[in-house]
């Protein structure tokens, strides 16, 4: 049914879906706090621009009776139920923030006539790519995939003189929501990653992974996995690892590696960690990043979603344009806005761009050091440490195929 949008006459509302099934187990109260802080900043910015309007949020909670797995497994129906709730109330904001689960976002996008923008903190899967009115504020799987292909092909760096064309992917089904979709994208036979690699095998059992570490007949020296150092240790323990094995540990939303007092454990020496660059405020204030690290990225994406809406609202109001139009719904892309922690850039498809950082463990200092950075916006790699103190022979990454290159 046609739902009227509470989005005119100087009063602009944001519909926030507070789903029990969420990409990250973040207390809903924290997300509410993030939204409310975002609203306050938006109000301040609009006042600063001389725009005397009201901006509020309506939090839509599901009853949690049926869809109570807590993770994303039962999110498809929960998302649609919340949309039904909005429809029954005949009340929709100018923008929908949430859901975060790929399943629910995909289904909601399919099942609704989207004449309003949808902003998601999550929705990592490839099935949520290229959606005209969907904006994603946490790095989606496509961005990871493009980095990996770029890095595999790179062969002109002092520490990487071989192109790679093979990989193992460890995926055992217990991953967090972000990791699940990242690995799912790498596994998919039709994905860009699969298309560009000559050999790729998914390891699904712990034993398969453990056997590969010393298997002389392995087809690749490179293993991609997703999670934190503790996850790797549980799997690998103190087992011996062949000297030309390279483990790529995807751990995007974890900034513990950048803390001053962090020492890399010994089992991380043949691991390259892929994470996101810690946000840097334009003001370069030492407090620009003082959100609690564990809460940071997910709640911050909600907050930035509010700021993004405020940014677009300001532009449309200043231009005297209507908010309840397809033009507004399609405008949340190909732009940079001022986020909570500094500028946030969205690509042509409304997906957040970021700087990914590849870290290695220095054999000298036992500290994590930046090997290179990768700008997802321009799909370009920038080497940082030209003479890394690697564990690998000659301080070069080995070839991906056993028996060739530095051993």
């Amino acid at each position: 049914s046609q739902v009227s949008q509470n989005c005119h006459n100087g009063s602009y509302e944001i519909s926030v879906l507070m789903m029990g099934n969420s990409a990250f187990a973040e207390p809903l109260k924290n997300l509410e706090d993030a939204v409310n802080e975002g609203l306050e900043i938006v109000r301040g910015r609009l006042q600063n621009a001389g725009l005397n309007v009201t901006v509020n949020a309506t939090f839509m909670y599901s009853d949690g009776l049926i869809h109570n797995s807590g993770d994303c497994r039962s999110s498809t129906c929960e998302g649609l139920d919340l949309l039904r709730k909005i429809s029954n109330a005949q009340r929709m904001g100018c923008v929908l923030i949430g859901p975060s689960c790929t399943y629910s976002t995909f289904q909601m996008y399919l099942d609704t006539e989207l004449s309003y923008p949808m902003i998601s903190a999550g929705s990592f899967g490839l099935s949520c790519d290229y959606k005209e009115t969907l904006t994603r504020l946490m790095s989606p799987a496509r961005k990871l995939m493009y980095f990996l292909v770029n890095f595999w092909k790179t062969n002109d760096l002092p520490f990487k003189t071989y192109s790679w064309s093979t990989s193992y992917v460890y995926k055992n089904g217990t991953e967090t929501e972000d990791c699940f979709w990242y690995l799912n994208a790498l596994e998919a036979s039709v994905s860009y990653f699969s298309h560009e690699l000559g050999f790729k095998v998914v390891l699904r059992q712990d034993k398969e992974f453990q056997d590969i570490l010393m298997d002389h007949n392995r087809k690749s020296n490179v293993i991609i996995m997703c999670g934190g150092p503790e996850f790797l240790y549980k799997l690998k323990g103190d087992r011996a690892v062949a000297e030309d094995i390279v483990i790529i540990l995807v751990d995007l939303f974890n900034d513990q590696y950048f803390e001053d007092n962090v020492t890399a454990p010994d089992y991380m020496k043949n691991v390259l960690v892929l994470t996101l660059s810690p946000g840097n405020s334009l003001l370069n204030s030492s407090f620009s990043r003082n959100l609690s690290p564990t809460k940071r990225d997910f709640a911050l994406a909600y907050l930035n979603g509010i700021l993004l809406f405020g940014h677009m609202l300001k532009i449309f109001l200043e231009n005297g344009e209507n908010i309840t139009t397809p033009k507004f719904a399609h405008a949340f892309r190909n732009l940079t806005f001022e986020g909570y922690d500094g500028p946030v850039t969205l690509d042509d498809w409304g997906d957040v761009d970021s700087t990914m950082v590849l870290l290695y463990t220095s054999v000298d200092t036992k500290k994590y050091k930046v090997l290179l950075t990768y700008d997802t916006h321009v799909n370009k790699t920038y080497p940082v440490d030209m003479s890394p103190t690697f564990t690998w022979k000659n301080s070069k990454l080995p070839n991906d195929i056993t028996g060739r290159g530095p051993q």
Epitope: E37, L291, S292
Partner: antibody, heavy 121, light 106 residues
């Protein structure tokens, strides 16, 4: 460079009124919550009042509630503290400070140099 | 409101000595913040989120604690560390400061 410059302090008789100002520059003033904090001579810091970035949320210390009013002008990047029914115990150096109001970012990361208020007959 | 009690109120320490000052909260708080203030100067943020040093703060400083008990430690006292240190919480409204610990050099 972030700068907070307080002004408006001075000598006032008990029961009198005064308005303090804090001019902000070098940052997006409208993105930040702002506070007034005071320090009586040879004493510790005492938080006085807070106003959120969009002025929707305002808090006061019990000691000033009903007498002091915090406000801001996001166009002019200025914070104010209107003080009435002043008492001798309000004598202090008054600092403005900025913060955010979210999770761990609730730190007063920049402070002005302070403006002195003396309440005496 | 949450009351923060700092101890000791005054410390006189020789250069090179280890210094530990404490801040006790009347109710549990998630994080503690610390500020340094020198005479005739504004307070400076010193430690945030309990244990993170503000930019420019020497590595000899550290912060720790949880719940109702927090501390600031200087591993080896230097002359420039002489100042008053205030703890602060904003776990709940209103924000509150401790009464301060004055650190003098012997």
């Amino acid at each position: 460079e972030v700068q907070l410059v307080e002004s408006g302090g001075g000598l006032v008789k008990p029961g009198g009124s005064l308005k303090l100002s804090c001019a902000a520059s070098g940052f997006a003033f409208s993105d930040y919550g702002m506070h007034w904090v005071r320090q009586a001579p040879e004493k510790g810091l005492e938080w006085v009042a807070h106003i959120s970035s969009g002025s929707s949320t305002i808090y006061y210390a019990d000691t000033v509630k009903g007498r002091f009013t915090i406000s801001r002008d996001n166009v002019k990047n200025t914070l104010f503290l209107q003080m009435t029914s002043l008492r001798s115990e309000d004598t202090a150096m008054y600092y403005c400070a900025r913060s955010r109001n979210y999770y761990g970012s609730r730190v007063f990361d920049y402070w002005g140099q302070g403006t002195p208020l003396t309440v005496s007959s | 409101q949450i009351v923060l009690t700092q101890s000791p109120a005054l410390m006189s320490v020789s250069p090179g000595e280890k210094v530990t000052m404490t801040c006790s909260a009347s109710s549990s708080v998630n994080y503690m913040y610390w500020y340094q203030q020198k005479p005739r100067s504004s307070p400076k943020p010193w430690i945030y989120l309990t244990s993170n040093l503000a930019s420019g703060v020497p590595a000899r400083f550290s912060g720790s604690g949880s719940g109702t008990s927090y501390s600031l430690t200087i591993s080896s006292m230097e002359a420039e560390d002489a100042a008053t240190y205030y703890c602060q919480q904003w776990n709940s409204n209103p924000p509150t400061f401790g009464s301060g610990t004055k650190l003098e050099i012997k």
